[in-house]
Interface confidence: low
């Protein structure tokens, strides 16, 4: 209540919106053929939608999202020596959510 | 650089530090012996340490935990009516993180 | 200050209909969930109702399930109780409360009541 | 659902005197008990959350104490402004319960 403390706060719902997530640049982003190469940086955050919505039928999802090219390094090993060079990794943004009801197909008869 | 528009930023690293992240509380937490009812509200905000380190033999780690209560509603359904009581679950909170080295097994000679 | 602020009582027939409303001011209106409570004449209180901050969220007493809905407008800062089919026993002054949050179900801050008054 | 008791319903007492009002459940409800003041023709107004918890702006002198099932309201001091009615309310399940009321008088 307005103005109270009690030891245990009660538990406020986790709205759905938009939050910063950890998102692992791994290596086929940047090349499916060659595994003898290395990716900085390893990591980089994002904007993703997540959170809970009012009952179990709706689901928190991203109502506008904006793709975001970034310039990693792609360190590749030649000869016991690293090469630099760059590479793009285009990363997803959700830049709005909603509480969205979860379409489950109907049976066919 | 200043003054040019590049199409790609470069890539920053997801540094190592608490971010907020969502948890699913599951009804376990509350009642182990009966499934026939549902927790209020269904998920909430914790910190949470994440991120990358300079190199792949170290992981971003809590090097200091909070533990934190908060009053939960146990939504009870008795003959198709639902009875509201309070519960505690106890959160865990990341207050600091650190760049660990992974600690692997010697194999066994 | 917190200001609750009820309207909309008044005399009504047996089976009729009337809308509570409740104004609220000094407080984050959205965050809190709220309640309507109900006292008849020259007898203690009795709960009615109780809606989530979001509106989600609603709860009743079973002497009034079904014909009382309770309702909030956050843009207005406005709460509402819409009752139909009243009977006499719903005589009473209806008062708003601020019930806290998620797990607090009681009622911290009220108005000052409205009187409702069901009679042929 | 759970039925709130109050004792006495109704007692005298001077100024100055230590008031103790008592409300019990029906079934063990915690300590998620709350008490409230009602004036004459006025709105009740929240003085003990939590069985023991004191409202803000609430005087010291209003104490609550008990848990599980026997709870008490203890005013340490009567003042001439405490004369009033006193509910107790569970907040453990709905629906949502009072006592019926201790009224307070002046002796």
């Known amino acids: 209540s307005l103005g109270s403390l009690a030891a245990a706060e009660p538990a406020v719902i986790a709205e759905c919106k938009t939050r910063t997530e950890v998102f692992q640049i791994s290596r086929n982003l940047i090349d499916r053929t060659n595994a003898n190469f290395l990716v900085w940086p390893p990591c980089v955050e994002v904007q993703r939608c997540s959170g809970c919505c009012n009952n179990r039928n709706v689901q928190c999802r991203a109502s506008q999202v904006q793709m975001r090219p970034v310039q990693v390094r792609k360190i590749e090993i030649v000869r016991k020596k690293p090469i630099f060079k760059k590479a793009t990794v285009t990363l997803e943004d959700h830049l709005a959510c909603k509480c969205e009801t979860i379409v489950t197909p109907r049976p066919v008869t | 650089s200043l003054g040019s528009l590049a199409a790609a930023e470069p890539a920053v690293i997801a540094e190592c530090k608490t971010r907020t992240e969502v948890f699913q509380i599951s009804r376990n937490l509350i009642d182990r012996t009966n499934a026939n009812f549902l927790v209020w509200p269904p998920c909430v905000e914790v910190q949470r340490c994440s991120g990358c380190c300079n190199n792949r033999n170290v992981q971003c780690r809590a090097s200091q935990v909070q533990m934190r209560p908060v009053q939960v509603r146990k939504i009870e359904i008795v003959r198709k009516k639902p009875i509201f009581k309070k519960a505690t679950v106890t959160l865990e909170d990341h207050l600091a993180c650190k760049c660990e080295t992974i600690v692997t097994p010697r194999p066994v000679t | 200050e917190v200001q609750l602020v009820e309207s909309g009582g008044g005399l009504v027939q047996p089976g009729g209909s009337l809308r509570l409303s409740c104004a609220a001011s000094?407080?984050?209106?959205?965050?809190?969930?709220m309640s309507w409570v109900r006292q008849a004449p020259e007898k203690g209180l009795e709960w009615v109702s109780t809606i989530s901050d979001g509106g989600g969220l609603t709860y009743y007493a079973d002497s009034v399930k079904g014909r009382f809905t309770i309702s909030r407008d956050n843009a207005k800062n406005s709460l509402y109780l819409q009752m139909n089919s009243l009977r006499a026993e719903d005589t009473a002054v209806y008062y708003c409360a601020e019930s806290g949050g998620y797990t607090d179900w009681l009622f911290g801050y009220w108005g000052q009541g409205t009187l409702v008054t069901v009679s042929s | 659902d759970i039925q709130m008791t109050q004792s006495p319903s109704s007692l005298s007492a001077s100024v100055g005197d230590r008031v103790a009002i008592t409300c019990r459940a029906s079934?063990?409800?915690?300590?998620?008990l709350n008490w409230y003041q009602q004036k004459p023709g006025k709105a009740p107004k929240l003085l003990i959350y939590?069985?023991?918890s004191l409202q803000s702006g609430v005087p010291s002198r209003f104490s609550g104490s008990g848990s599980g099932t026997d709870f008490t309201l203890t005013i340490s001091s009567l003042q001439p402004e405490d004369f009033a009615t006193y509910y107790c309310q569970q907040s453990y399940s709905t629906p949502l319960t009072f006592g019926g009321g201790t009224k307070v008088e002046i002796k």
């Open positions: 000094g407080f984050t209106f959205s965050s809190y969930w």
């Open positions: 079934q063990s409800i915690s300590n998620y």
């Open positions: 939590a069985a023991s």
